[in-house]
């Protein structure tokens, strides 16, 4: 699996999307987990509704939410009030029994300021970037969410780096 980099700004919200084959993963619940080291299991953060048909319902664990569009084949994770310690390597997973298939490996980066990144222009305007080997970078910048407010899809720019 290649790694997809999602960048957000501290204090704001970040939306991570994981596309998948809706037919292949039909009937399967999904999960969002964090890889805490090179070895060892991926630590579960949040999973979709126990009833697959209700996977579209947003489920929260702390400041992290998950919702699944099972027809369109898109799992969406929202990290609200992003903090530096939210940065890390994560996985979107498709669950079947006690097994889990990795849908996407995601590297979440939390910037102190949108202008901190050396390719800061990409945060606002699509453009060529330097070098992220085997990484697909999605810069997601969105406003902070008010308590209880439903997140909206942020502005995203998708770049494939080879």
């Amino acid at each position: 699996h290649n790694t997809t980099v999602f960048q957000g700004v501290a204090g704001q919200s970040l939306q991570v999307s994981c596309p998948y084959d809706s037919m292949k993963h039909w009937g399967r619940r999904k999960a969002w987990c964090r890889q805490l080291g090179e070895k060892g299991p991926c630590q579960r953060v949040v999973s979709t509704h126990n009833l697959w048909l209700l996977s579209f319902l947003r489920r929260w664990n702390g400041s992290t939410a998950i919702t699944d569009d099972t027809l369109g084949g898109t799992l969406t994770i929202t990290l609200r009030n992003l903090q530096p310690h939210d940065a890390g390597l994560y996985q979107c997973q498709s669950l079947h029994g006690s097994e889990a298939d990795t849908l996407r490996k995601v590297l979440v980066e939390v910037l102190a300021d949108p202008l901190d990144h050396r390719d800061a222009g990409d945060l606002w305007f699509p453009g060529e970037s330097e070098s992220f080997e085997d990484a697909h970078v999605e810069h997601s910048i969105s406003r902070s969410l008010l308590e209880g407010e439903i997140p909206f899809p942020p502005t995203s720019h998708h770049h494939h780096h080879h």
Partner: antibody
């Protein structure tokens, strides 16, 4: 293991680039932080770089003063300080973060690089 | 920025004595705090992270605790190698900030 470059004496107005060579782990898997300690004073966080992507976050106080970079091929992190004044005379430490993050703080520290700014 | 107020700034104690250092956070840091030890030669070592988790290889006489916005480092029985400078570090939010330090000296 983090091995920092040796002490330097530089003139006011000049720039200095110090290095922090990492060994014993996968360099791109761990964040690298830089910290300043002026003589007899506490520690100040300068900024952090993700060696995998080159993304950086700085302490506002050091924006425009410090520039963090990495060379993945040599597993080395660099910090350049420009327009040096006597206020920049200090020991500078590199400190490794945790796996693609700083969620457990800074487990490992370099030995520090002494920078002296003097005419 | 989050201010970390560390006390005392200096402390004289005897071998075998129990000592406690405290850091107070000006804002919520949710346990994202570590304690560092700096020896006279400048070497820095992390002792505790996540407020109370002891680093591997760190003697059990060191312990960390939290009470609201107050975070403490306790050394249950001082040994000669413990006389050094100690700093707390919050890594909950940018910019990360350190306490002013505590110089622990032999009485």
């Amino acid at each position: 293991q983090l091995q920092e470059s040796g002490p330097v004496l530089v003139k006011p107005g000049a720039s200095v680039k110090m290095s922090c060579k990492a060994s014993g782990y996968t360099f791109t898997d761990y964040y690298m932080n830089w910290v300043k300690q002026s003589h007899g004073k506490s520690l100040e966080w300068i900024g952090v770089i993700n060696p995998y992507t080159g993304a950086t976050s700085y302490n506002q106080k050091f924006k425009g003063k410090a520039t963090l970079t990495v060379d993945k091929s040599s597993s080395t992190a660099y910090m350049e300080l420009n327009s040096l004044t006597s206020e920049d005379s200090a020991v500078y430490y590199c400190a490794r973060g945790t796996y693609y993050s700083n969620y457990e703080g800074f487990p490992y520290w370099g030995q520090g690089t002494l920078v002296t700014v003097s005419a | 920025d989050i201010q970390m107020t560390q006390s005392p700034s200096s402390l004289s104690a005897s071998l075998g004595e129990r000592v406690s250092l405290t850091c107070r956070a000006s804002q919520e840091i949710s346990g994202y705090l570590s304690w560092l030890q700096q020896k006279p030669d400048g070497t820095i070592k992390r002792l505790i992270y996540a407020a109370s988790t002891l680093d591997s290889g760190v003697p059990k006489r060191f312990s960390g605790s939290r009470s609201g916005s107050d975070y403490s480092l306790t050394i249950s029985s001082l040994e000669s190698e413990d006389f050094a400078d100690y700093y707390c570090l919050q890594y909950a939010s940018y910019p990360y900030t350190f306490g002013g330090g505590t110089k622990l000296e032999i009485k």
